[in-house]
Every structure is written in C-alpha cells, then in structure tokens.
Interface confidence: medium
C-alpha cells in the first residue's frame, strides 16, 4: 500500500491471541518487551511521546507463537488477559505475561497503522 499525502493516520486496536509453545518445563511466548513505569521512557524507540511509560514489544521471534499470532515489533500492550498494562512496572508486565497457569495469552495492543509506518519511512 503506498502512502497518499493527506490520508488520515490512525492507530488500530487489535486483540492478539498467543498460544504459548511448550518446550520442556517452559512455556514460550516468542517476544520481548520494553518499557514500564520504572523505566526511562526517553529510551523507548517506539513511542512518539517520550513521556510514555507503556509496555512495548521490542522483539518478535521468527516463527514463534507471537509472530504466528500477528504480534508486531512496536505494538503497545494495553491489556494482558483483561489486566491493564498501561501503568505497570517492567517486572509486573513480565510476570503477567509469563504466568504458568495461562497457556493462552490474549493481548490488547495498539499499533501505528500501515499508512503511518509508510509515511515515517518516507520521511526518514
């Protein structure tokens, strides 16, 4: 899709369902996170607002459960299985994502639309 100047830029909200992969004793999600209210938001390359202390996806393993489910680098995680993730520490976020009792993780994420990504790539 090519970017048309003047085209509205929107953020979309999607639910991403990740079915954890069992590897021995471990349940694998296949992605990494950054951010949290205890972290320095200015170091977050994905947020436009440099005071944003949200949780962001920083890495997605190729062929892993998260990639298969449609999670993308730069996604902001708003909820994990119904739990609010907008005001949590990095460690709280990690613990909510890796609860051993939950084999399915339902994330609510916001992401910049394709138009915006294309727009930014043209500007860079």
């Amino acid at each position: 899709m090519s970017y048309i100047p003047g085209q509205p830029v929107t953020a979309v909200v999607q639910r991403v369902e990740i079915h954890k992969l069992r590897q021995g004793e471990n349940l694998i999600l296949g992605f990494s996170i950054g951010g949290g209210i205890d972290q320095d938001p200015s170091q977050n390359p994905f947020s436009e607002d440099k005071t944003d202390k949200g949780i962001y996806v920083t890495r997605v393993s190729e062929g892993g459960p998260a990639e298969i489910a449609g999670l993308q680098i730069g996604d902001k995680i708003m909820q994990v299985n119904g739990w609010d993730m907008t005001m949590v520490t990095h460690d709280q976020a990690r613990k909510r994502l890796t609860k051993r009792s939950e084999e399915v993780v339902r994330l609510l994420v916001t992401r910049q639309s394709l138009q915006k990504a294309v727009q930014q790539s043209m500007l860079s």
């Epitope: 979309v12 639910r15 369902e17 079915h19 299985n81 119904g82 939950e102």
Partner: antibody, heavy 123, light 112 residues
C-alpha cells in the same frame, strides 16, 4: 447440539439492576467464550463484551464498561450479565452468543446464539 | 471504532433473483495475523441472528451454497444467487479484526 438458553423477559424500574442469564449445553462450556450483544427496537446489533468461563477473563466494549458486568458459573454452565443503573435507554433485547477465538479454524466469532432476553425499563 | 457501512438499506427482490449486499469498513480489517475477520449474519423476523459466512468467504456449516462472500481490505460483498422465501430478513456484516468488534447497520431483504 449446541444450545444457549436465555432467561425470560424482564421488567425493571429506572435506577435498578437486573441480571440476565444464558445457560449453555451441547458443548464444553469452558472451551469457548460467551459474548453479549444488544439490539434496541428496530435497530442493529452492538457488542457489549465477552467472558471466557475457563479463566473468568472479561473483555468489554468501552461504551458498556460502566453498564454491564459479566460473570460465568462453570458448575452450571451459565453465563450472567448484570446491567446497572438502568434507564429507559437500556430497554432492548439482549442476546448471548458463543464466541470463538481467532485460532478457531471452524465457524465465526458468534457461531451460536441464544433466543434473546427482552428488557423493558419503565417506571 | 471501525464503522461498517452497508448498502442498500433495503433490497426488494423477486424470488429466484440474485441479490447483492455491499459492506464497507472505515479502515482495513486485515488482522495482524493476516486473516480478515469479516462475517455475515442473517436475522429473520422475531429470531436471533445466524452465522452465514466467516473470514470473508467461508460458509458456516449448513449454509446453502447459494450464499457466497467476497472482498478484501475495506470492501466486501454478500451474494445470494437465487433468493428463496426463507432468505428474507435483515443481513448484517461484522468485523472482528479490531477492538471493539462492530456490526454494520443491516440490510433488509424483502419481496418486491
């Protein structure tokens, strides 16, 4: 066969609360979600929210977050929706529907529906 | 929220004719996992809605093959090749790709 049996018509006073129920049969209750959908007279359909009975996790349309509370009783395979602080605007038919996940290869989001519960709010 | 716009509002047809209903979303409804969660439901008078089509073009079990769905991105169509009396009612399109999931306003299929 899959069936969702909803509770009967309700008449409630403004300001009151009401609890609607949806009893599931014909499938494993904890294997899918239960969604609730509102339809005002002569109007279209609007998703209120859903609950996954196995975990109790709930998801709401922001518009209905203050209005509806979803619960599920695994022992009786019944989902409930409590509607609070009722006004005449809440008068509608409320449907429950089995909601499937993105990973379901068969069927859509709402593959089976209850018959609907009419709610009238009037003083 | 994603706005789903259906046209026409009302569709008068003769039995045996082909009917076509259009549904347009306010933004692309391709999910991050590559699927397009566009569905069609039929609500007959006095009944609850019934699933007809899921993921744009897949017929739900028991749905006759005279019903077909097509489209991509933001534009979708439901076609009924030969309308029968039992097909009358209100048709709704629905998107489940974005949160909250949303329905179209409905198209009433009626006898001409």
């Amino acid at each position: 066969q899959v069936q969702l049996q909803q509770s009967g018509a309700e008449l409630a006073r403004p300001g009151a609360s009401v609890k609607l129920s949806c009893k599931a049969s014909g499938y494993t209750f904890t294997s899918s979600g239960i969604s609730w959908v509102i339809q005002k007279t002569g109007q279209g359909l609007e998703w209120i929210g859903e609950i996954y009975p196995r975990s109790g996790n709930t998801y709401y349309n922001e518009k209905f977050k203050a209005k509806a509370a979803l619960t599920a009783d695994k022992s009786s395979s019944t989902a409930h929706m409590e509607l609070r602080s009722l006004t005449s605007e809440d008068s509608a038919v409320y449907f429950c529907a089995r909601s499937k996940t993105y990973y379901s290869k068969y069927g859509g989001f709402f593959d089976y529906w209850g018959q609907g519960t009419p709610l009238t709010v009037s003083s | 929220d994603v706005l789903m716009t259906q046209t026409p509002l009302s569709l008068p047809v003769s039995l045996g004719d082909q009917a076509s209903i259009s549904c347009r979303s306010s933004q692309s409804i391709v999910h991050g996992n590559g699927n397009t969660y566009l569905e069609w439901y039929l609500q007959k008078p006095g009944q609850s809605p019934k699933l007809l089509i899921h993921k744009v073009s897949n017929r739900f079990s028991g749905v006759p093959d005279r019903f077909s769905g097509s489209g991509s991105g933001t534009d979708f169509t439901l076609k009924i090749s030969r309308v029968e009396a039992e097909d009358l009612g209100v048709y709704y399109c629905f998107q489940g790709s974005h949160v909250p999931p949303t329905f179209g306003g409905g198209t009433k299929l009626e006898i001409k």
